[in-house]
C-alpha cells in the first residue's frame, strides 16, 4: 500500500508568493511559493495519486503583515481552503497567547491540530479541551493512518503560551500515544511536529512504532540529487534514521516559507511496515501557475493589509536616527530602539532566580536602512518601519559562549571606518573599543547585563559561560561576515518578524524617545 505525504513547515505567513529569498515578491515572473501556487500543485498530485495526505508541521503564524493584521484568521481560512489533513502546533502559534491560538485557529480549523506533549492545566484545561489533540486517526483510501503531534518543549522560552500549558519532553509524551494507536489496531503512524531536525531524528530513533517523521522548526532543507534553488541540503531526502529496534525510519522537512512542497512516497507492507520511501521537496517556482480562485481570495484579503500599513502605530518625539552615517559608526538611537524592542518581545519570567531568560541583543548596523523623522507629527506607521527593516527577517534567540560574543565584537570593528554593515548595535551590553589597537584586539571592555539577578546590573563577559542573545536571523546565519556565530552557536530558535517586533513595542509604548546613552564607547 502506497501513501503520498505532502508536507509544509515554517510557512510563517507567506500567503502571497515571494522572491527567491522568501522576501516580498518584486518581479512576479521570478516569484515562488504562496498558497495559490501551493494549491495548484497539491491538487495536481491529489488528482494523480490515490492516497494523499497534506500535513503541516507548525509555525504557520508570524512572519509578514498578514499575521500582524489577521492574527491567524488567515491561516485557518487558507489552510481550510487547501484542505490540509492535519497540522502540528509550532512555537509561533502561541505568539499571541493561548487566546490568539484558540479563537482564530483552533476554533476555525476544519482539520485536526495536534500536539501530544502539550498538556493543559487549571482553568484552561476545560476551555481548550478537544480543540487540539495528541493524535488523530485519519482514513486514507481503505486504510487508516495515525498522526501524532509534537511541539518544541522550548516553546515557553520562545513564545507566549502562558502558565497553564505544560510542554513535556517530546519522546516521553509521544511513546504512550503511539502505543495506544498500536493497541487500537493502527499500524501506520506518522509523527508530525515542530521541534527541529535533531529532535526529529531522536524521535525516529527512540519512539517505538513511529514509521515516518515529518518535522519543522529548524528550516531544514533535505534533497536527493541536484538542488533546484539556492538552499544547500543538510542531507538526503528522506533522511533515514535506524531506530533502536532496527527499523529504517524516514525523516523529512521542507525548508520553510512555503517555497517548497515536501513530497514523500512511502510503501507499506500488509503489517504496516515501511518497505520503501522516496521523494524530494518540490520547488514551487513560477512554472507552477497560481490557482485563480485562491489568488482571487488572496487579493480580496490583501485590501485590509494596504489600509493597515498607513495607520499610526505610535509616536516618536525624537528623531530616530537610522542613517548609515550613524548606525555603521557609533551607537544610534534607532539601534537602541530596535534592540530594546527585541528584548521586550522576549520577556519570559523564567523563575524567581531570573528576572528574564535573556538580556542581550546585537544587531548589525547595516540592517538598519532608514531613519524616521519626528517632524511628521511624530507618527510612526508600518510603512515607516518597513523602510527601516525592509528585508523581512526575524529576530532569533541563540545560545553562544562568551568567547564567541567576544569574537563577534572584534569582527564588528575589524575594518572600522569604511561604512560597512557589520558594526553592531546593542542592548543589555556595554562595549568599549580602542581603535588604536590592531584588528582582532580592539575590544577593551565588554560588560553584559545579568539575568540571574533581581536587580539587573552589568558584569564582565565570561569567556566560558553560555549566554542567550537575541539577534537578526541574518547574523545567526553568519551574515555580514559573522561566521563565528553560525559556526559556534550552541542553539538557534527562529523568532518573530522584525517589523512586527518593533511595531508591537511602539504600539505598547505609545510614545517613544530613545536616546544615545553610552552602550557603545570608544577609548
Amino acid at each position: 500500500w502506497e501513501l503520498t505525504i505532502l508536507h509544509t513547515n515554517d510557512v510563517h505567513s507567506r500567503l502571497e508568493q515571494t522572491s527567491e529569498d522568501s522576501s516580498k515578491c518584486v518581479n512576479a515572473s521570478r516569484c515562488m511559493g504562496g498558497v495559490a501556487r501551493l494549491f495548484t500543485k497539491v491538487q495536481q498530485i491529489r488528482r494523480a495519486e490515490p492516497n494523499v495526505l497534506l500535513l503541516d508541521a507548525g509555525d504557520q503564524y508570524q512572519g509578514t503583515i498578514w499575521f500582524t493584521v489577521y492574527k491567524g484568521a488567515e491561516v485557518a481560512h487558507f489552510m481550510n481552503a487547501l484542505r490540509y489533513d492535519a497540522m502540528a502546533l509550532g512555537n509561533h502559534e502561541f505568539d499571541n497567547g493561548v487566546e490568539g491560538l484558540i479563537e482564530p485557529l483552533l476554533k476555525e480549523a476544519k482539520f485536526p491540530i495536534l500536539s501530544a506533549n502539550i498538556k493543559a492545566k487549571g482553568p484552561l484545561a476545560s476551555q481548550i479541551s478537544g480543540l487540539y489533540l495528541p493524535y488523530k486517526v485519519l482514513p486514507v483510501g481503505d486504510e487508516v493512518v495515525g498522526i501524532v503531534g509534537y511541539t518544541s518543549k522550548e516553546t515557553p522560552f520562545l513564545s507566549n503560551p502562558g502558565t497553564n500549558l505544560v510542554f513535556e519532553d517530546e519522546i516521553t509524551a509521544l511513546q504512550p500515544e503511539v502505543d495506544k494507536l498500536k493497541t487500537l489496531n493502527v499500524n501506520k503512524i506518522i509523527a508530525l511536529g515542530h521541534s527541529g531536525f535533531e529532535t526529529d531524528k531522536l524521535i525516529a530513533q527512540k519512539v517505538r512504532g513511529v514509521d515516518v517523521v515529518v518535522g519543522g522548526h529548524s528550516n531544514t532543507f533535505l534533497y536527493t540529487g541536484n538542488p533546484p534553488s539556492k538552499e544547500v541540503p543538510a542531507g538526503k531526502y528522506p533522511f533515514i534514521v535506524t531506530s533502536d529496534d532496527g527499523r529504517k525510519v524516514p525523516v523529512v522537512q521542507a525548508y520553510a516559507f512555503g517555497k517548497y512542497l515536501g513530497y514523500l512516497k512511502i510503501e507499506f507492507d500488509e503489517r504496516g511496515n515501511v518497505i520503501s520511501s522516496h521523494g524530494n521537496p518540490i520547488l514551487l517556482n513560477s512554472s507552477i501557475p497560481e490557482d485563480p480562485s485562491i489568488k482571487a481570495d488572496i487579493n480580496k484579503w490583501r485590501i485590509k493589509l494596504d489600509n493597515y500599513s498607513t495607520q499610526e502605530l505610535g509616536k516618536t518625539i525624537v528623531y530616530l536616527d537610522g542613517s548609515s552615517q550613524s548606525c555603521r559608526f557609533r551607537e544610534c538611537n534607532m539601534g537602541n530602539l530596535i534592540c530594546d524592542a527585541m528584548i521586550n518581545n522576549n520577556l519570559r519570567h523564567a523563575d524567581e532566580m531570573f528576572w528574564n531568560h535573556v538580556s542581550m541583543c546585537i544587531l548589525n548596523g547595516g540592517g538598519i536602512r532608514s531613519p524616521i523623522d519626528e517632524r511628521n507629527n511624530g507618527t510612526i506607521t508600518w510603512e515607516n518601519l518597513a523602510a527601516v527593516l525592509p528585508f523581512g527577517g526575524t529576530f532569533d534567540l541563540v545560545q553562544l559562549k562568551g568567547s564567541t560574543l567576544k569574537k563577534a565584537f572584534e569582527h564588528s570593528v575589524h575594518r572600522y571606518g569604511q561604512s560597512t554593515g557589520e558594526f553592531l548595535q546593542v542592548g543589555g551590553i556595554h562595549v568599549v573599543y580602542d581603535l588604536s589597537r590592531k584588528p582582532g584586539d580592539r575590544v577593551v571592555k565588554l560588560d553584559v547585563l545579568c539575568t540571574k539577578c533581581r536587580v539587573p546590573s552589568y558584569d564582565p563577559l565570561k569567556m566560558d559561560e553560555i549566554y542567550k542573545v537575541i539577534l537578526p536571523n541574518f547574523l545567526a546565519n553568519g551574515g555580514d561576515g559573522f561566521q563565528m556565530i553560525k559556526d559556534e552557536l550552541l542553539r538557534h530558535d527562529s523568532g518573530d518578524q522584525d517589523i512586527n517586533v518593533v511595531s508591537t513595542y511602539i504600539s505598547k509604548m505609545k510614545v517613544i524617545y530613545p536616546a544615545v546613552e553610552g552602550r557603545i564607547k570608544f577609548s
Epitope: 484545561a125 479541551s129 478537544g130 486517526v137 485519519l138 482514513p139 487508516v144 504512550p176 502505543d179 495506544k180 498500536k182 493497541t183 487500537l184 489496531n185 493502527v186 499500524n187 517505538r208 512504532g209 503489517r271
Partner: antibody
Framework: QVQLVQSGGGVVQPGRSLRLSCAAS????????MHWVRQAPGKGLEWVAV????????YYADSVKGRFTISRDNSKNSLFLQMNSLRDDDTATYYC??????????????????WGQGTLVTVSS | QSVLTQPPSASGTPGQRVTISCSGS????????VSWYQHLPGTAPQLLIY???HRPSGVPDRFSGSKSGTSASLAISGLQSEDEADYYC???????????FGTGTKVTVL
C-alpha cells in the same frame, strides 16, 4: 464465520497458576488487538488486559499487574492469558474479545466486537 | 473499582422508553468513543451500540446512544421483554492505559 473459542479454565488452588487459551478463526488475527475481560460471580464486567496486533504492547488492569501475562502467537491465531499467584478474588468467568477500530465516514469507533464463549476459573482451597 | 458510573437498575413496562446514563471523565469518555454491551445471563456479552447511534448489524433501531462531554447514555425505546439484561458502557481510558467498563445497569421489564 468470525469466531473465538476459549479453553483452559478450571478449579485451581490459591497461589497456583493457570493458562487460558483463545483460538481465533474467520478473520486476520494478526491485524487485531485482543483483550481479556472477566466477570466475578454477582459482579460486573472487569477489563483484564490487552495486547496489540503484533504483540509489542501489553496493558493490564491494576488488579492483575505483575501476576498475569497476556501473549499471542499470530502464526497459530492464538491468544493466551498466563495467570500466576492466583487469589480467591480472581474467581470469575474469563472472556477473550477482539478489539475493533470501526470506520464510519471519517470517524473511528473502538469496541470489543467479537467475544469468546467464556471459561470459568475457580480459585479455591 | 470501575471509573464509569451507571445506575444499578432501570425498569419499564413493555413499549416504554428507558434511558441509562454513564458518567466518566476527560481521560475516558471525554477523549474516546463509547460502546455499549448487552449481557444476558449464561452468554457472552454482545456489542450493542457505538457512540453516536451506530449499531452493528442485527441490533434493532430501538437502541440508540449518545455522548456529551464526559457522559454518555443509552436509550431503549419500545421496551421488549427480551431486552431484560445487564447493560455496560465502556471506553478506553488514557490515564489508566486500558479499557474500562461501567458499573453495569440491570434492566427489568415489568
Amino acid at each position: 464465520q468470525v469466531q473465538l473459542v476459549q479453553s483452559g479454565g478450571g478449579v485451581v488452588q490459591p497461589g497456583r497458576s493457570l493458562r487460558l487459551s483463545c483460538a481465533a478463526s474467520g478473520f486476520t488475527f494478526s491485524s487485531y488487538g485482543m483483550h481479556w475481560v472477566r466477570q466475578a460471580p454477582g459482579k460486573g464486567l472487569e477489563w483484564v488486559a490487552v495486547i496489540s496486533y503484533d504483540g509489542s504492547i501489553k496493558y493490564y488492569a491494576d488488579s492483575v499487574k505483575g501476576r498475569f501475562t497476556i501473549s499471542r502467537d499470530n502464526s497459530k491465531n492464538s491468544l493466551f492469558l498466563q495467570m500466576n499467584s492466583l487469589r480467591d478474588d480472581d474467581t470469575a468467568t474469563y472472556y477473550c474479545a477482539r478489539g475493533h477500530l470501526l470506520r464510519i465516514g471519517d470517524i473511528f469507533y473502538y469496541s470489543l466486537d467479537v467475544w469468546g464463549q467464556g471459561t470459568l476459573v475457580t480459585v479455591s482451597s | 473499582q470501575s471509573v464509569l458510573t451507571q445506575p444499578p437498575s432501570a425498569s419499564g413496562t413493555p413499549g416504554q422508553r428507558v434511558t441509562i446514563s454513564c458518567s466518566g471523565s476527560s481521560s475516558n469518555i471525554g477523549s474516546n468513543t463509547v460502546s455499549w454491551y448487552q449481557h444476558l445471563p449464561g452468554t457472552a456479552p454482545q456489542l450493542l451500540i457505538y457512540t453516536n447511534n451506530h449499531r452493528p448489524s442485527g441490533v434493532p433501531d430501538r437502541f440508540s446512544g449518545s455522548k456529551s462531554g464526559t457522559s454518555a447514555s443509552l436509550a431503549i425505546s419500545g421496551l421488549q421483554s427480551e431486552d431484560e439484561a445487564d447493560y455496560y458502557c465502556a471506553a478506553w481510558d488514557d490515564s489508566l492505559s486500558g479499557y474500562v467498563f461501567g458499573t453495569g445497569t440491570k434492566v427489568t421489564v415489568l
